[in-house]
Interface confidence: low
């Protein structure tokens, strides 16, 4: 904690500007008043403090607000959010995407911090649910950002949110997460006709139960090998020649490759042999 | 080596049928599937269809699934294309392509093309 | 159907350039996408599958890339015996489709 001393004469801020920079820390906390570097944060990213300086300015900011700071501060903190702990940020309420957003630009381009962790807990949990909007922001600066949840976290997401997921927000979920997310897509998008409806799905199918793999092979989707493989065992397993054959289009010539990795290595083992053979692609139960 | 053999030219009265060839050597013929692919003079391929050998399954290109019939001889590793009520629009060159998926490539080998003329 | 379209019907070239042909899908189609050179009189012989892979004994002037819609057969170094067709082609979905063509020509 910073010693309490009086301000020098003549040294007393009237505002936040760059004078400051050539401050001590002492100074700093002698000569700088709470309010009105709370009502004048928006400058403080615009001046080249210290980290040691930065310390100073949290540490009054932490005296005025000792419940937590309020949202309009919040959304101007900068780089001063780098000096927040999780347990600050805990203490905080915030409502507003574009405070979220602000926060999250500072930490652009790092890994998920534990503050920004905290800080996205904090957001989701107040608005209740993981809205569209929300989605679209944190898998615009994360895109490994839905895979990070729980099945139990993700059970909150609302259909309609599924819209602002792109395929590649998807590379790193677990069946289990595809399990709780592919019902959500498939109510999200089932008012799309045929070849609409499966671009959007494709990315979800690795949560797709056997039923619903039976009917899309009715459908002349093409599915290709890279989604085919993310196919749950369980649900290719019951599928038969025919059904895989409808499913893929020109992709079946591909199982050839794909013979000794899972799913195909399984659901080969699954199949007699004389209905394999109508496949024309050598593959041996 | 892998060969694709087709005849050179056909000619044939429009109203008629046509019955193309297609013969594979220097592979196990029921191990891939063969597309055909029609090219009109200075222009671009389209796509016909294709038929897995092992089983005579086909798929057609719905454009011209009335055009073309596809059907395959495994005795003679053969696989052939049948058009009928030929006109004009049908005078071109027809290839034969294998579909080699053991690499996943398209067609690694092609036959050298049969120039069908439909003339009176 | 997927439309594969090559804008650039005739590309004027010398020995020695660099040359980009271009190719749009309609829709997208992941990497599933095949480059083939046609002299003429002759099949067509394949160059490129998936997009950016060379088939076995295609010099390595010859390279692929793109994904989804946009994708480019680039000769890095032009050789005479290089003046000819280039179709590329979807294997995405039935029907499989082909780009008009781009013709190499001398400048």
């Known amino acids: 904690e910073v010693e309490k001393t009086a301000c020098p004469s003549g040294k007393k801020a009237p505002e936040i500007d760059e004078s400051l920079i050539f401050y001590k820390k002492w100074e700093l906390e002698a000569c700088v008043d709470a309010a009105l570097l709370a009502t004048q944060m928006d400058r403080v990213n615009a001046i080249p403090f210290t980290y040691e300086q930065l310390d100073v300015l949290k540490h009054k900011l932490d005296e005025l607000y000792p419940q937590g700071y309020p949202e309009s501060v919040i959304q101007h903190l900068g780089y001063l959010f780098l000096k927040m702990s999780p347990e600050d940020i805990r203490k905080w309420n915030v409502t507003s995407l574009e405070t979220l957003k602000a926060l999250l630009e500072v930490n652009k381009g790092h890994e998920m911090s534990p503050q920004v962790a905290t800080l996205i807990d904090r957001f989701v949990k107040g608005r209740g649910q993981l809205d569209k909007d929300t989605l679209d922001t944190l898998t615009a600066f994360y895109p490994g950002y839905l895979c990070s949840l729980s099945p139990e976290e993700l059970s909150s997401v609302p259909p309609s949110s599924i819209w602002a997921v792109r395929p590649q927000d998807l590379d790193t979920c677990d069946p289990r997460q595809l399990d709780v997310l592919y019902p959500k897509a498939r109510l999200a998008f089932q008012n799309m006709n045929g070849s609409e409806y499966f671009v959007k799905i494709q990315s979800f199918l690795g949560g797709a139960p056997t039923e619903d793999l039976k009917a899309l092979s009715q459908q002349n989707v093409s599915m290709d090998l890279a989604t085919f493989m993310k196919l749950r065992t369980d649900a290719v397993l019951p599928l038969t020649v025919a059904e895989v054959q409808k499913l893929l289009g020109p992709h079946v010539e591909g199982l050839k490759a794909e013979e000794r990795h899972r799913p195909v290595r399984d659901w080969i083992l699954r199949q007699r042999q004389d209905d394999l053979d109508t496949l024309g692609l050598g593959l041996q139960g | 080596q892998v060969q694709l053999q087709q005849p050179g030219t056909e000619l044939v009265k429009p109203g008629a049928s046509v019955k193309l060839s297609c013969k594979a050597s220097g592979y196990t013929f029921t191990s891939y599937w063969m597309h055909w692919v029609k090219q009109r003079p200075g222009q671009g391929l389209e796509w016909i269809g294709n038929?897995?050998?092992?089983?005579?399954?086909?798929n057609y290109n719905e454009k011209i699934k009335n055009k073309a019939t596809l059907t395959v001889d495994k005795s003679s590793s053969t696989a052939y294309m049948q058009l009928s009520s030929l006109t004009s629009e049908d005078s071109a060159v027809y290839y034969c392509?294998?579909?080699?998926?053991?690499?996943?490539?398209?067609?690694?080998?092609w036959g050298q093309g049969t120039t069908l003329t439909v003339s009176s | 159907d997927i439309v594969m379209t090559q804008s650039q019907k005739f590309m004027s070239t010398t020995v020695g350039d660099r040359v980009s042909i271009t190719c749009k899908a309609s829709q997208n189609v992941g990497t599933a996408v095949a480059w083939y050179q046609q002299k003429p009189g002759q099949s067509p012989k394949l160059l490129i599958y998936?997009?950016?892979n060379r088939y076995t004994g295609v010099p390595d002037r010859f390279t692929g890339s793109g994904s989804g819609t946009d994708f480019t057969l680039t000769i890095s170094n032009m050789q005479s015996e290089d003046l000819a067709d280039y179709f590329c082609q979807q294997y995405s979905s039935y029907p499989l489709t082909f780009g008009a063509g781009t013709k190499l020509e001398l400048k």
């Open positions: 998936s997009a950016s």
């Open positions: 038929i897995n050998p092992s089983n005579g399954g086909t």
């Open positions: 392509a294998r579909w080699n998926y053991y690499g996943n490539y398209p067609f690694d080998y």
